[in-house]
Amino acid sequence: AWELTILHTNDVHSRLEQTSEDSSKCVNASRCMGGVARLFTKVQQIRRAEPNVLLLDAGDQYQGTIWFTVYKGAEVAHFMNALRYDAMALGNHEFDNGVEGLIEPLLKEAKFPILSANIKAKGPLASQISGLYLPYKVLPVGDEVVGIVGYTSKETPFLSNPGTNLVFEDEITALQPEVDKLKTLNVNKIIALGHSGFEMDKLIAQKVRGVDVVVGGHSNTFLYTGNPPSKEVPAGKYPFIVTSDDGRKVPVVQAYAFGKYLGYLKIEFDERGNVISSHGNPILLNSSIPEDPSIKADINKWRIKLDNYSTQELGKTIVYLDGSSQSCRFRECNMGNLICDAMINNNLRHTDEMFWNHVSMCILNGGGIRSPIDERNNGTITWENLAAVLPFGGTFDLVQLKGSTLKKAFEHSVHRYGQSTGEFLQVGGIHVVYDLSRKPGDRVVKLDVLCTKCRVPSYDPLKMDEVYKVILPNFLANGGDGFQMIKDELLRHDSGDQDINVVSTYISKMKVIYPAVEGRIKFSTGSH
């Protein structure tokens, strides 16, 4: 028998520095977690203690904090090289700055293979990107070889900006021939490493003949065997065992997100490359693991540019941006409109001639807007200003919901109206009318939504049975502020870009902004 240790991360999302327990900015260092300096310590300990170790990343290193905003992927290449990753799969967020924003900072600089079998380049891009990412890589480990085959969510064109010269194929269809090729090369130990979410990971384990282990990402899935060490609730045991269609037991793993855990899986193979046993658990990277001081010093050196960036002007406002709780928790506020407009703008994807865009709607809890911005400071807007408006380090995500769920959400928005509670929704691509004289749960008297399958966008009544795409904060997607119906009834959820980054990009693009209160939210006569 031959034993392999797989160390894995996924959805790190630019958390290069240690974070608080909820993966936001570290405040009390003695209780902080993760970060590349701490990860390095643990990885080095394991590499020294065990003979056959692979360090893998399942995508979405890009996007999530000011680190990515400023360094645009150079930070990912630098610190992943320092940690000596063995391979990485492309995630959807690796395309957030277009293909060039992937090629130059990451693909050309990484000292490790970057993989995806289901992304095919065409046209002029094919020769430019050739060899910079691979469908698979055979890695010698000790006296054996291990094949790593990559995959990426086929929804990436809807979630990011890969452009028109990359085709995202069905994962299973694309993986099978590559695995078959590895088999013909006498590679009998094969890891599928990719970024399509836990459901697809399990399908790959079930359907792709020859895959021995699946290391996934995208869905931020936390798996654990035994008592979990922090706040995350396990979605199943680690590893999660799937019985393949040809009768094999295939371990599937994922390691939550944000670099909080290091996935640790030990696999025992027989001489024919069959998995005999698999066991392990994610390792919580808490303060009991010291940060490597040299990596920490390097982080601090890179940090300097971030501090400078946060005070630079992004653009100007010529109007007061009303982000006060007195406005945003009671009525339409122009800060809410600005943020929702930025959220929609960030998700413009012309992927189908029938649709002007794939999504037109935005909802945003008023309680998530934490500060106004005064235009009387020469109109200047900085990252620092936006960090006061959106201090929680969240993301603006894409969900699919039925009309009936949206209706419930808007009823919840005003079910206890008047108490300055955070659930009051700001909107984009939606016209809502409330009648507060009616009883809670029956206060939405009009709900019109902007069409997507149209050449001239217009507002049509919401249809209860229709499925709609909506951009919203991850906080709402996870049922925050009492929006349990969103969490319980959503049909799809893809995590998006860092909230501040979305708004800052929009402001930089627009240069001068002047959002108005324009009648997106109304109250019927006599009730307000």
């Epitope: 390095f40 090289n81 010698p140 040299s294």
Partner: antibody, heavy 121, light 107 residues
Framework: EVQLVESGGGLVQTGRSLRLSCAAS????????MHWVRQAPGKGLEWVSD????????GYADSVKGRFTISRDNAKNSLYLQMNSLRAEDTALYYC??????????????WGQGILVTVSS | DIQMTQSPSSLSASVGDRVTITCRAS??????LAWYQQKPEKAPKSLIY???SLQSGVPSRFSGSGSGTDFTLTISSLQPEDFATYYC?????????FGQGTRLEIK
Amino acid sequence: EVQLVESGGGLVQTGRSLRLSCAASGFTFDDYAMHWVRQAPGKGLEWVSDISWNSDIIGYADSVKGRFTISRDNAKNSLYLQMNSLRAEDTALYYCAKDIYGSGSSFFDYWGQGILVTVSS
Amino acid sequence: DIQMTQSPSSLSASVGDRVTITCRASQYISSWLAWYQQKPEKAPKSLIYAASSLQSGVPSRFSGSGSGTDFTLTISSLQPEDFATYYCQQYHSYPPTFGQGTRLEIK
């Protein structure tokens, strides 16, 4: 300017002990792993031992395991190599070298000038 | 342990020549290879790390390439101060191991 200065070498009889020291300056000593590398007369370089920044991770070449002990005193910016049961084949120039990382197992960006250890029978 | 084999063991060249030294690892080491220069009676000096990254202060006539198991150190135009012994070292797997050295002498 980074400086590594070895001391404690000399002529010693087989089976006896010797303790090498390395005084470091010009960098934050307790941020980095440190190594001992040796070079027998007219021969190539051979890695001997390393120690991580906080002494948590320590390793030895098979040829010295059980006989040599590496240690460090971060308060004194010093690295040590206690060499027991010395053999003729331990005769070499011993270099103290700085790793680029705290947890070690990397390459060496700065080296001392070396100290000669001669083991005679 | 991973064995590192350098070739040639020694070579003679003239000032201005382009010189290439190769290093082969007994196992895959990705890009985790360093090159050192050692002059007689002196300590080794770091030249290149991660197979191709130049250490700060090292002249640009030195370059490194390769990945996997085969690596090269190239000196594009030999200068008098470049006559020395050159060592490769892998740091992919523990313990770190060195090549036996390549002695570069004046023709």
